[in-house]
């Protein structure tokens, strides 16, 4: 991982992928240390502030421009050395995103799965971006790359990711590049929280003051388990967003959040799955489902929840 | 958004110490440096020297070295600037501001107006 | 140490004007310039970087143009927001310096 006998390892943090006017510090790592180092861009453009100076430690690049976008390595000191340098690190490559309009990101067959599936990833865009990029939130290793398919006017591109495992669960963002601009990315696409589900038991799912329900009587859902889930999650059949609640420990000694429907106006099969903070995109098999049925005068839709949900913002902590 | 904000006024005897704090949020601290400038009375702006966020190497001006100490606490995204042995001419506003190694200062904090007088 | 020399202590200009101020290195700064402005009781803030780069936020009626050691910031069309101190600062090499400054004003 270090690098050969002779070569440092180039990284940076938190990530290559750095937006339009924000920092990224690039690390130089040789002979068991962070080192002074040099650094190089290969296309030798915009790095007046690299020549002839030494850096300790790290260097802290940015505020970033397109201009930045390249590749870069360093060389670590060697004070006994005939140069005083070692030979030249990984090559590393910094993308700048910010720079065209943000391709579409859509998960097929959907964003919530069962350990062991595979999922498609798909980037889309009516700009004729030439490769699409794929990235995980969090991860600092270069993202995946895939040359961009033009079809009646739109470019995409498809990416498989799976078998699905914890460490695969996220927030997926995607960019485009254009020709002669390889390393001068879109801004990012929506994020896209991809969720494993059946990593945990599962909880259960009852109905206050039960499923058969008076059109217009007020509905609770409780979810619950003897695991100390941190976050419950809610989802109702056909419907793409999830309600989450934190879980508030009980006296029988089970972790349960209650989640008030309002109203009955319409059934539906509803599901809860408990998650863990640490891991919020992990969750637990999926409860037994419960259809709740409303008798009297059922309209078209049920009441809005009463706090907004997102399709993005599930792998986020609850504060 | 991105904010840097310093503690309040201070004033000083000549010979005493003064520690000033910029805590930033609305970004990841350990990734970009704290710069510090000086702004004294009728005059411009004067770089003091920065300190890298991610490794806390400081670096000094020649002017404000031996006196003038850079600090972090990653912890709670705080960076400090303390002078001691404080003279009149240490008298001005000192600015906390976001910036790395290409000295590009891109967010400021309020200033702390530090006056020594005996 | 690169000296910074903003040759105008004072602008005048009225609102709508193109206004454009200058500043010279004592040596070829490779287009590592940024401007601040700094309005009357606030702390600076960044206009432009890298010579011609707008920061997040700015108007773009805030450009910047020059190489070598001379270097401009022009302001297309005035507005009464923009009286201001405007400082130029080369960031080449250590120590970072600034320009005195040019003080905006609206007649």
């Known amino acids: 991982l270090m690098g050969g006998q002779d070569k440092p390892f180039l990284s940076a943090r938190p990530s290559t992928v750095v937006p339009r006017g924000g920092h990224v510090a690039l690390q130089c790592h040789y002979r068991r240390g962070f080192n002074n180092f040099m650094l190089y861009k290969e296309d030798r453009s915009h790095v007046p502030i690299f020549h002839g100076r030494i850096f300790q430690e790290s260097f802290i690049m940015g505020p970033v421009t397109p201009a930045h976008a390249g590749t870069y390595r360093c060389r670590g000191s060697r004070p006994h050395s005939l140069t005083g340098w070692s030979a030249p690190s990984n090559p590393l490559v910094i993308m700048v995103t910010g720079n065209h309009r943000k391709p579409s990101l859509l998960a097929h067959p959907g964003p919530l799965l069962k350990s062991g599936e595979t999922v498609i990833l798909q980037c889309w865009s009516d700009v004729m971006f030439e490769h699409f990029f794929l990235h995980r939130e969090g991860i600092s290793e270069d993202p995946s790359r895939l040359v961009g398919q033009i079809h009646d006017g739109v470019s995409k591109a498809n990416f498989s990711i799976g078998p699905l495992m914890p460490v695969l669960a996220g927030t997926y963002r995607c960019y485009g590049s254009v020709p002669h601009s390889p390393y001068q990315l879109s801004a990012p696409s929506d994020p896209l929280d991809i969720v494993i589900t059946g990593l945990y038991e599962k909880p259960s799912l009852s109905a206050q003051p039960g499923p058969t329900v008076q059109a217009g009587e007020n509905v609770t859902l409780s979810c619950s388990s003897w695991s100390s889930y941190d976050i419950y999650h809610l989802s109702r059949e056909g419907e793409a967003h999830e309600r989450r609640l934190r879980a508030v420990p009980k006296v029988n000694r089970t972790f349960q959040a209650d989640f008030p429907l309002g109203p009955a106006t319409h059934g539906g099969t509803y599901r809860c799955f408990g998650s863990f903070r640490a891991l919020p995109c992990v969750w637990s098999n999926s409860s037994d489902p419960l259809l709740v049925s409303v008798t009297g005068n059922p309209s078209s839709s049920w009441p809005s929840p009463t706090e907004p949900s997102s399709k993005s913002g599930i792998c986020r902590h609850l504060h | 958004q991105i904010q840097l904000v310093q503690s309040g006024s201070e004033l000083k005897k000549p010979g005493a110490s003064v520690k000033v704090s910029c805590k930033a949020s609305?970004?990841?601290?350990?990734?970009?440096?704290m710069q510090w400038v000086q702004k004294s009375p009728g005059q411009g702006l004067e770089w003091i020297g920065w300190i890298n966020s991610h490794s806390g190497v400081p670096k000094y001006a020649e002017d404000f070295k031996g006196r003038f100490a850079f600090s972090l606490d990653t912890s709670v995204s705080t960076a400090y600037l303390q002078i001691s042995s404080l003279k009149a001419e240490d008298t001005a506003v000192y600015f906390c501001?976001?910036?790395?190694?290409?000295?590009?200062?891109?967010?400021w904090g309020q200033g702390t107006t530090v006056t020594v007088s005996s | 140490d690169i000296v910074m020399t903003q040759s105008h202590k004072f602008l005048s200009a009225s609102v709508g004007d193109r206004v454009t101020f200058t500043c010279k290195a004592s040596q070829d700064v490779s287009t590592a310039v940024a401007w601040y402005q700094q309005k009357p009781g606030q702390s600076p803030k960044l206009l432009i970087y890298?010579?011609?780069t707008r920061h997040t936020g700015v108007p773009d009626r805030f450009s910047g143009s020059g190489s070598g050691t001379d270097y401009t910031l022009t302001i297309s069309s005035v507005q009464a927001e923009d009286v201001a101190v405007y400082y130029c600062?080369?960031?080449?090499?250590?120590?970072?310096?600034f320009g005195g400054g040019t003080k905006l004003e609206i007649k």
């Open positions: 890298w010579t011609s």
């Open positions: 600062q080369q960031h080449y090499s250590t120590p970072w310096t």
């Open positions: 609305g970004y990841t601290f350990t990734t970009a440096g």
């Open positions: 501001a976001r910036g790395g190694d290409e000295g590009v200062m891109d967010y």
